[in-house]
């Protein structure tokens, strides 16, 4: 595929890659599929620089980030390391909290109002941001 | 790489007290809920009591319900059980078990409470 | 509390046999069980989770099935190394509890 040097349309560049903020609700593994439709993924935070950004931009609302431990451990969607990585939670957070009476706990991972993270229930119908990296390649084929 | 080590087992009398200790490595673990599990010498597993990442929630198995107190030290990496008035039922392998389907466990510890 | 019934609770089976174990939870768990092998003197190691994927590492013919109150794991050749006992726990709601366990035997 070609590279992609700058974002698509309604998209945020940032440091070298590109957001998109949603403005509607879906489950955590909808807005995975969303993003991943888009050659994205679920936005991945690396540093406070990029919460911040991402804190700007989405406001005091709940939005999905890409980080589950549906799987066990706690995972980035981009595959960065979770245990070394930039972490930003609540206080006593991640708590996997189980008295929602949904079924199961907590799996995946927002940003609350703060902007500091929670777990969740995956299924909640909340915000999301996808994210790309410029420079990698895309799917669409070459220009010939 | 994942590990958890449990510690603290032995002979204890009826009545007796003894305390576990689990030590974690190779993940956050703090950003885990944790738990004990036991498996009486030819039985089934039972779970025993789970602990939240920061401690603010705890649950416990009606049998060791007032007896047994979960706890944690996250800046140890350890998890611990405190167990107070022992009965002969208590007699068990005690394992400890990383999230609520235990997708990591421990080798475990035996405690063996005589009459 | 949400029972688990596990059936059988032991079976004789040859190296090659499809294998079948039953799960029956006492109320609707969606599909919040997971399938423990346990061989004899070591820890259980988790199987499968949310009642169908495959834990990293475990090979591909173990299979788990179900949601709501019935669930199945399948071993779909029988291996040497499987004979062991194995579990279902349902993590929906505390106290988290186990089935009773199935013991597979060599016939």
């Known amino acids: 595929g070609s590279e992609r040097t700058c974002c698509p349309v309604n998209w945020v560049e940032h440091e070298r890659s590109c957001y998109w903020f949603s403005r509607s609700g879906k489950a955590w593994a909808d807005a995975d599929n969303y993003c991943r439709l888009e050659d994205a993924h679920l936005v991945v935070v690396t540093s406070w620089e990029e919460q911040k950004f991402v804190q700007h931009h989405i406001g005091p609302v709940n939005t999905w980030m890409g980080l589950h431990d549906q799987n066990g451990p706690w995972k980035w969607v981009d595959g960065t390391d979770y245990e070394t990585g930039f972490k930003n939670w609540r206080p006593e957070q991640p708590d996997d909290w189980y008295g929602h009476g949904l079924g199961g706990g907590e799996d995946c991972a927002h940003f609350t109002d703060d902007g500091r993270w929670n777990d969740d229930v995956c299924q909640r119908p909340y915000r999301w941001v996808c994210e790309t990296e410029l420079d990698k390649a895309s799917q669409e084929p070459p220009l010939l | 790489e994942v590990q958890l080590v449990e510690s603290g087992g032995g002979l204890v009398k009826s009545g007796g007290s003894l305390r576990l200790s689990c030590a974690a490595s190779?993940?956050?673990?703090?950003?885990?809920?944790m738990n004990w599990v036991r498996q009486a010498p030819g039985k089934g597993l039972e779970w025993v009591s789970s602990i939240s990442g920061s401690s603010s929630y705890i649950d416990y198995a009606d049998s060791v319900k007032g007896r047994f107190t979960i706890s944690r030290d996250n800046a140890k990496n350890s998890l611990y059980l405190q167990m107070n008035s022992l009965r002969a039922e208590d007699t068990a392998v005690y394992y400890c078990?990383?999230?609520?389907?235990?997708?990591?466990w421990g080798q475990g510890t035996l405690v063996t409470v005589s009459s | 509390d949400i029972q688990m019934t596990q059936s059988p609770s032991s079976l004789s089976a040859s190296v090659g046999d499809r294998v079948t174990i039953t799960c029956r939870a006492s109320q609707d768990i969606s599909n919040y069980l997971v399938w423990f092998q346990q061989k004899l003197g070591k820890a259980p190691k988790s199987l499968i989770y949310v009642a169908s994927s495959l834990q990293s590492g475990v090979p591909s013919r173990f299979s788990g099935s179900g949601s709501g109150t019935d669930f199945t794991l399948t071993i779909s050749s029988l291996q040497p190394e499987d004979f062991a006992t194995y579990y279902c726990q349902q993590y929906n709601s505390y106290p988290l509890t186990f089935g009773g366990g199935t013991k597979v035997e060599i016939k």
């Open positions: 078990a990383r999230k609520s389907w235990f997708d990591y």
């Open positions: 190779g993940f956050t673990f703090s950003s885990y809920r």
